[in-house]
Amino acid sequence: GDLLIQKTIKKQVVLEEGTIAFKNWVKTGTEVYRQFWIFDVQNPQEVMMNSSNIQVKQRGPYTYRVRFLAKENVTQDAEDNTVSFLQPNGAIFEPSLSVGTEADNFTVLNLAVAAASHIYQNQFVQMILNSLINKSKSSMFQVRTLRELLWGYRDPFLSLVPYPVTTTVGLFYPYNNTADGVYKVFNGKDNISKVAIIDTYKGKRNLSYWESHCDMINGTDAASFPPFVEKSQVLQFFSSDICRSIYAVFESDVNLKGIPVYRFVLPSKAFASPVENPDNYCFCTEKIISKNCTSYGVLDISKCKEGRPVYISLPHFLYASPDVSEPIDGLNPNEEEHRTYLDIEPITGFTLQFAKRLQVNLLVKPSEKIQVLKNLKRNYIVPILWLNETGTIGDEKANMFRSQVTGKIN
């Protein structure tokens, strides 16, 4: 009996036309939502003038439906048993699941000012930037609508730069009508233990953002894993959002709509400093902000973001070192709300429920030559927003799963 089930599972999880896995893989049957909480700065004047702690108040959720588009350019390669595809991006605002509208205003760090002052450190260039910042009446902080902040706005300061630069700024700009990839993943035809594991991303086996093993593209995209998952496994996956591969470990058994699943979580060790977790040495890319690689819980992804000083963390700086959150008031990290987890059905390896949580932060540094930054006495890793991307298997699909998979085994 068990052998027959194993054989059936192996057949059905292959990523090729006609299998259950393929149908759900091309276009997810699960509704996926991305909730945003924006950190509204309460004391912009005090920060800019006196280098005070930044007082933030989160506002949200503002919810978008995402991942509703089918994979594009799906191409099987029989020679190396891979399938390649693009994952199109799309986001639709869901007013009924949101606390306000896309026109809501927020006081946030001026993204262009923070980024430009970081990218162009030459003193003479900074003097020019200063005059353009002042001329455009730009400041350290700005008021932007949710739509502008997420999806892009024309920046008045960048619009004055006398040589060609992208004048549109947004945390997720460009997003709609773009695609992530090309991904090339193993389809599992020759070896089921490799199914969904990424072979190449954008034509490469490495990212070119990190040194050594940190630069590797490991595992799947976390939507599924090879079948027959064991609790002892460390599940590796790659996330283009954070420009790195990461891993999850077993935490507990969970019952999801009558289906036994394994809850895997991202452990705090994955965010630790090299002092505590030597494997993380290659995620420490500079010595000053990281305090000689002793800070933890924030990931400098500037190399992946054209030099813009973007730092990724868990929401509210969960699992981050005290020095990171010390200059920010109003954060309340807690594991239940702010950690990432994957609920995996162990027989098929399918992720039936997940919550991916991350926070986008921007570094801003004092600058003698830029007036709106010259009163700062310290560096700040400024939280801009955090997001919670969730998906849960629908009731209908769960029934089908119970009858066809778990029901047959028990």
Epitope: M48, V143, Q371, V372
Partner: nanobody, 126 residues
Framework: QVQLQESGGGLVQPGGSLRLSCAAS????????IGWFRQAPGKEREGIVY????????YYADSVKGRFTISRDNAKNTVYLQMNSLKPEDTAVYYC???????????????????WGQGTQVTVSS
């Protein structure tokens, strides 16, 4: 003609009070953020207080916090600066300035301001 005019300056003893006015003509002040600056002899002009146009938010430099108060009377198209507990180091020429279109006024960058008054002298001396 667009104009800002300060008044109310003068000679006052340490510990005394003065109320400066900044009256606008040729434009409506309630659409503008208003800043007060001062320039002491031999020193650079410094921003001391402003009131934003959008939400009436105020900001005071540490040197005047708790002693000076800014307010606006839109009906009279005038902004006031009430100065209490004056000290000799408050001696300076006081200027008001108006900035349109900046709902995020978070500092005293002179280039932000579209219109300036001529200034009024404040002398604090016994």
């Amino acid at each position: 003609q667009v104009q800002l005019q300060e008044s109310g300056g003068g000679l006052v003893q340490p510990g005394g009070s003065l109320r400066l006015s900044c009256a606008a003509s040729g434009f409506t002040l309630d659409y503008y953020a208003i800043g007060w600056f001062r320039q002491a002899p031999g020193k650079e002009r410094e921003g001391i207080v402003y009131i934003s146009n959008s939400d009436g938010n105020t900001y005071y430099a540490d040197s005047v916090k708790g002693r000076f108060t800014i307010s606006r009377d839109n009906a009279k198209n005038t902004v006031y600066l009430q100065m209490n507990s004056l000290k000799p180091e408050d001696t300076a020429v006081y200027y008001c300035a108006a900035d349109q279109g900046s709902s995020v006024m978070h500092g005293f960058i002179e280039e932000w301001y579209d219109y300036w008054g001529q200034g009024t002298q404040v002398t604090v001396s016994s």
